[in-house]
């Protein structure tokens, strides 16, 4: 199900993004579920539609709910669903963990926090930066775009930062805040050749004509934070963006799954109304890193209806 | 292979090589090369499907492999040359699954000699 999670705080900008992606090209029409009422699209509203964004300014929290996007296309529709809550602004410093976005881990070399969500905003620098509500000062620490450095991480430096930022919106200025937390690892990482753990190589995956289907591609690079690593689908030696196909969407699963203390990579191939056409192609699940690349071909077959007895 | 010759140290070659016949797209290409009395040492490659690069560390960052696909040509742009760098270099396609400067690939040319004096 092509379901979002979003979260924002009251009195704050929220842009949320349609779980379904389209070419620009397409419309895409919002409706509140519950009622099954159509979001406008003028701006002067509150809430209102801009395309695959749908946007609180600001946000309240009777705007909670489930949302409704629908990506219309001269052949298809699609649809999604954007399941938006809003939470009242905490007194005291503690953030919430219903508030808290992906942790992400440092180490000495690479100590990048990225700001959640700033690229749906109309932002302009310098964001400004909490670590356990206190601003962050001193020449350790440095905004760069949307991201914070920091400058020889230590095992202090873990804890829970906030970006704030200001969302511009036909001239008016609203408040946006995302909190994440950050951990340091402290054990010597590496790096290895990419190791493909899905799919087998030249693995036919079986589907169904007019269904939907997923493909992963999931691979390890080494241990710790690994530095240019990547997983990605080509579909005839073409990247998916290139390919034309929107019926065929590319998206990350967990970013960096550090289970058995491995590095690891999934990316997930969504085919939505399977065509014959689709089994004439080979899916390569490429994963790359500093050392080199490794390629795993999938092809589609039409799973045959099995008789169910009883 | 083309592009070899004699270069004092620092200087700079730009070799190429014609991959006609060779398919372009799901490939990996290199070059490797072979100084007199030691082992074959890969040096770059290159993946067609997206021109994704790979580099052996003793040329990183000195040492750059394109393609242009309309001219199905392959080359390799050799900067801050250094005496070790002497040897016959072999522009290579085919290396199955994998793509990387140590690639073993199925398919390699005559090889074009290059020299650099200190």
């Known amino acids: 199900k092509f379901s979002k999670q979003s979260w924002g705080l009251e009195n704050e900008a929220l842009i949320v993004r349609c779980p379904r992606q389209g070419k620009p090209s397409y419309t895409v029409d919002w409706y509140y579920s519950q009622t099954n009422k159509s979001i406008p699209t003028q701006e002067r509203n509150r809430v209102f539609a801009s395309g695959q964004l749908l946007k609180f300014l600001p946000a309240a929290v009777a705007d909670s709910g489930i949302y409704t996007c629908i990506v219309r296309s001269p052949t298809f529709n699609r649809t999604g669903y954007a399941n938006v809550t809003i939470y009242k602004k905490q007194s005291d410093c503690n953030v919430p963990d219903y508030l808290m976005y992906s942790t992400v881990s440092g180490s000495e070399k690479n100590s990048k926090i990225y700001c959640p969500t700033i690229d749906l905003y109309n932002w302009t620098a310098p964001l400004e930066w909490f670590k356990n509500c206190q601003a962050l000062q001193g020449s350790r620490y440095r905004a760069h775009k949307s991201f914070l450095v920091i400058d020889n991480v230590m095992t202090e430096d873990a804890g829970d930062y906030t970006c704030k930022f200001i969302h511009n919106e036909n001239g008016a200025n609203y408040s946006v805040t995302a909190t994440r937390s950050f951990t340091v690892k402290d054990e010597q990482g590496f790096s290895l050749f990419p190791v493909i753990g899905a799919p087998a190589q030249n693995e036919i995956k079986e589907v169904e004509i007019g269904k939907n289907a997923n493909l992963t591609c999931s691979a390890c690079f080494g241990k710790g934070t690994q530095f240019l690593a990547a997983v990605l689908w080509q579909l005839n030696g073409t990247k998916i963006t290139d390919f034309g196909e929107p019926r065929i969407q590319q998206e990350e699963g967990q970013n960096q799954s550090f289970s058995n203390g491995l590095a690891c990579l999934d990316m997930v191939l969504r085919i939505a109304d399977v065509k014959e056409e689709d089994l004439l192609l080979q899916y390569d699940c490429l994963a790359l890193n500093l050392h080199g690349l490794r390629r795993h071909t999938v092809r589609l077959s039409r799973k045959n209806p099995i008789d169910h007895h009883s | 292979e083309s592009g070899g010759g004699s270069v004092q140290a620092g200087g700079s070659l730009r070799l190429s090589c014609a991959t006609s016949?060779?398919?372009?797209?799901?490939?990996?290409m290199g070059w490797f090369r072979q100084a007199p009395g030691k082992e074959r040492e890969g040096v770059a490659a290159?993946?067609?499907?997206?021109?994704?690069?790979f580099y052996a560390d003793s040329v990183k960052g000195r040492f750059t492999i394109s393609q242009d696909n309309a001219k199905n040509t392959l080359y390799l742009q050799m900067n801050t040359l250094k005496p070790e760098d002497t040897g016959i270099y072999y522009c290579?396609?085919?290396?199955?699954?994998?793509?990387?400067?140590?690639?073993?690939?199925?398919?390699w040319g005559q090889g074009t000699q290059v020299t650099v004096s200190s």
């Open positions: 016949g060779v398919t372009y797209r799901r490939t990996c």
């Open positions: 290579a396609a085919e290396a199955g699954d994998e793509c990387s400067a140590s690639s073993v690939f199925r398919s």
């Open positions: 290159i993946y067609t499907s997206g021109g994704f690069t």
